[in-house]
Amino acid sequence: PEPPTACREKQYLINSQCCSLCQPGQKLVSDCTEFTETECLPCGESEFLDTWNRETHCHQHKYCDPNLGLRVQQKGTSETDTICTCEEGWHCTSEACESCVLHRSCSPGFGVKQIATGVSDTICEPCPVGFFSNVSSAFEKCHPWTSCETKDLVVQQAGTNKTDVVCGPQDRLRA
């Protein structure tokens, strides 16, 4: 029985003949014939094709627009697209990284669980009992309440998720 595809993976069928696809980095100029092989040409500057193909035009490299907060993370080649990332303090809005937004800050009462990267936003978490955050920050974690006992002090004012405990001297009974 015939295989499901008459030609091999890096070939295509045209005019009852299996022609070679063009290798990555090259575009199709003319199909093969009985007398000639497939004719391919390298992609131009700022163009690429990343697969074996029969494209007659190469794709343009992605432009990392600084007005959208983008910068080049990896320069494109004839076989790969340019990879964009965001400027410091910003992150991509999508996997394709077509624009950037400012990293979010964690409000008081919340701490940073995971610091933002060029491709992911800050992840905040509520400060659990025994911890607090009194600032809006993209870097600060929840801090533990001060331990009055270790300073030989007592709690004068209880801590919250936004404030530290207030310690004071112990009330000593007069003799």
């Epitope: 008459a6 070939q11 003949q17 070679s20």
Partner: antibody, heavy 118, light 107 residues
């Protein structure tokens, strides 16, 4: 499964003729250029001839030009090599192979021995 | 005709070792070079096509590379099944020409 099976080899005297056949199966024979390659007992491999899909384009190595004829019958999925005026230096195992870009020589037959000797 | 100069002609390698075979083309052949493996009394088997592309089913320890007119076949960690005869072929122009081959043995 792609299969190429050569036949027609054997012992032949110098100056005589012999015809090799290669029966192809497991692929659409007419879509692929084909070739013959040989391997002498004490020497390396040598390309002999290539034929295009419908036989309109044929190439030979210089030493066999005018003596050997490559042909194909797409209806029978068979490749042929007609060898005339055989010489002792034609003694070799002859392989039938697909000559298809970008892979070239991607599948080979098991080979058939041709011995030219008096 | 394009001459393909292959080296070494034979090599003895220990299991697990890395080794490289080279073919040098006498004129420009672009990436039109294939590598084949042949076992005794068997037909050749395509390993690498267009200088760097691994044929389906060939273990990833095999790789092909090009530096100018020098083409290399490398086996990263030799296994016992890798013994045999290796040769290159240029497919850039007729007559298609072969390297003289390299016999690979286990030390």
């Amino acid at each position: 499964e792609v299969q190429l099976v050569e036949s027609g080899g054997g012992l032949v005297q110098p100056g005589r003729s012999m015809k090799l056949s290669c029966a192809a199966s497991g692929f659409t024979f007419s879509y692929f250029p084909m070739a013959w390659v040989r391997q002498a007992p004490t020497k390396g491999l040598e390309w002999v001839a290539t034929i295009s899909t419908s036989g309109g384009n044929i190439y030979y190595r210089d030493s066999v030009k005018g003596r050997f004829t490559i042909s194909r019958d797409n209806a029978k999925s068979t490749l042929y090599l007609q060898m005339n005026s055989l010489r002792s230096e034609d003694t070799a195992t002859y392989y039938c192979t697909r000559d298809t870009a970008p892979y070239y020589f991607d599948y080979w037959g098991q080979g058939v021995m041709v011995t030219v000797s008096s | 005709d394009i001459q393909m100069t292959q080296s070494p002609s034979s090599i003895s390698v220990s299991l697990g070792d890395r080794f490289t075979i080279t073919c040098r083309a006498s004129q420009d052949i672009g990436n039109y070079l294939n590598w084949y493996q042949q076992k005794p009394e068997k037909s050749p088997k395509l390993m690498i096509y267009r200088a760097t592309n691994l044929e389906d089913g060939v273990p990833s320890r095999f790789s092909g590379s090009r530096s100018g007119s020098d083409y290399s076949l490398t086996i990263n960690s030799l296994e016992s099944e890798d013994t045999g005869f290796y040769f290159c072929v240029q497919h850039k122009q007729y007559p298609l020409t072969f390297g003289s081959g390299t016999k690979l043995e286990i030390k």
